[in-house]
């Protein structure tokens, strides 16, 4: 049977917590990604940003999980209007910001 959306979001939060807690060296060698607007379409926007990071095993599971939340196919180099114009941040900061936002969505019961 399909995993309930609440459980899937919980799994994603757990994975992001693990990334932030287990981080020793700079995450993904300090790679920079486009900052995103967290107010709408957060899963696809996050995936569109993170998919451009290659060769970083630490976020591969996150990329796969975000893919499960995003209803359309996302490929590298693809950007939606949800990107914050011309602003790049480190992957570590991106993950922290995403985690804070997803935890709030979870607490509010907004799983879709």
């Amino acid at each position: 049977s399909p995993v309930p959306r609440s459980t899937a979001l919980k799994e994603l939060i757990e994975e992001l917590v693990n990334i932030t807690q287990n981080q020793k060296a700079p995450l993904c060698n300090g790679s920079m990604v486009w900052s995103i607007n967290l107010t709408a379409g957060v899963y696809c926007a996050a995936l569109e940003s993170l998919i451009n990071v290659s060769g970083c095993s630490a976020i591969e599971k996150t990329q796969r999980m975000l893919n499960g939340f995003c209803p359309h196919k996302v490929s590298a180099g693809q950007f939606s209007s949800l990107r914050v114009r011309d602003t790049k941040i480190e992957v570590a900061q991106f993950v922290k910001d995403l985690l804070v936002h997803l935890k709030k969505l979870f607490r509010e019961g907004r799983f879709n």
């Epitope: 995993v3 309930p4 609440s6 459980t7 919980k10 799994e11 939060i13 757990e14 917590v17 807690q21 935890k103 709030k104 979870f106 607490r107 509010e108 019961g109």
Partner: antibody, heavy 123, light 107 residues
């Protein structure tokens, strides 16, 4: 020391609104990751979760009672208030407030409880 | 809503006995399972959280285990002060739900 203390009317008439107050000691609901729950227990029965409020005013309710429940906080008084409208004798119970702390993963585990306040609904 | 089913509803055991209480969730709760002890006339007390973690001050004879939908509370050597009702609770997501309780008595 972390302590929670419930206060309520003791006796309420059917159809009236029950107002319960939980006063928090030893921690503040203005602190990130803090939450407070309300739980009730009818005499001789099990525990039923009613509502929850987080430090940032995010609220959740038991769907079976949502239309009758309102949870709010007064950070200046370090209090959480629960209102239950249109009470009925089946709402007779001991009402507890309890603290939840979210750390890392989001736990909903109530680590400190008040002593409870018995509310009887009767005419 | 996630339903929590506890068994047995009551049990009687001798001092020193090993006691196990079971709790089953209606769906996978990913180890977000808490146990509470409620002594007569008192408020519940958190005994175990996140399946097997213990708050400070909980005696070592209490332990928790399980995964997925099935969880267990074990008292390795029952003591007279353990007379109480024990409740499981899922902490995955609201609405938070409790098991019906297990009343533990001494033979």
């Amino acid at each position: 020391e972390v302590t929670l203390r419930e206060s309520g009317p003791g006796l309420v008439k059917p159809t009236q609104t029950l107002t319960l107050t939980c006063t928090l000691y030893g921690f503040s609901l203005s602190t990130s990751d803090m939450g407070v729950d309300w739980i009730r227990q009818p005499p001789g029965k099990g525990l039923e979760w009613l509502a929850h409020i987080w430090w940032d005013d995010v609220k959740r309710y038991n769907p079976a009672l949502k239309s009758r429940l309102t949870i709010s906080k007064d950070t200046s008084k370090n209090q959480v208030v629960l209102k239950l409208t249109s009470v009925d004798p089946v709402d007779t119970a001991t009402y507890y407030c309890a603290r939840t702390v979210s750390s890392g993963y989001i736990y909903y585990a109530m680590d400190y409880w008040g002593q409870g306040t018995l509310v009887t609904v009767s005419s | 809503d996630i339903q929590m089913t506890q068994s047995p509803s009551s049990l009687s055991a001798s001092v020193g006995d090993r006691v196990t209480i079971s709790c089953r969730a209606s769906q996978d709760i990913r180890n977000y399972l808490n146990w509470y002890q409620q002594k007569p006339g008192k408020a519940p007390k958190l005994l175990i959280f996140y399946t097997s973690m213990k708050p400070r001050g909980v005696p070592s004879r209490f332990s928790g285990s399980g995964s997925g939908t099935d969880y267990t509370l074990t008292i390795s050597s029952l003591q007279p002060e353990d007379i109480a009702t024990y409740y499981c609770q899922q902490g995955l997501t609201p609405p938070l739900t409790f098991g019906g309780g297990t009343k533990v008595e001494i033979k």
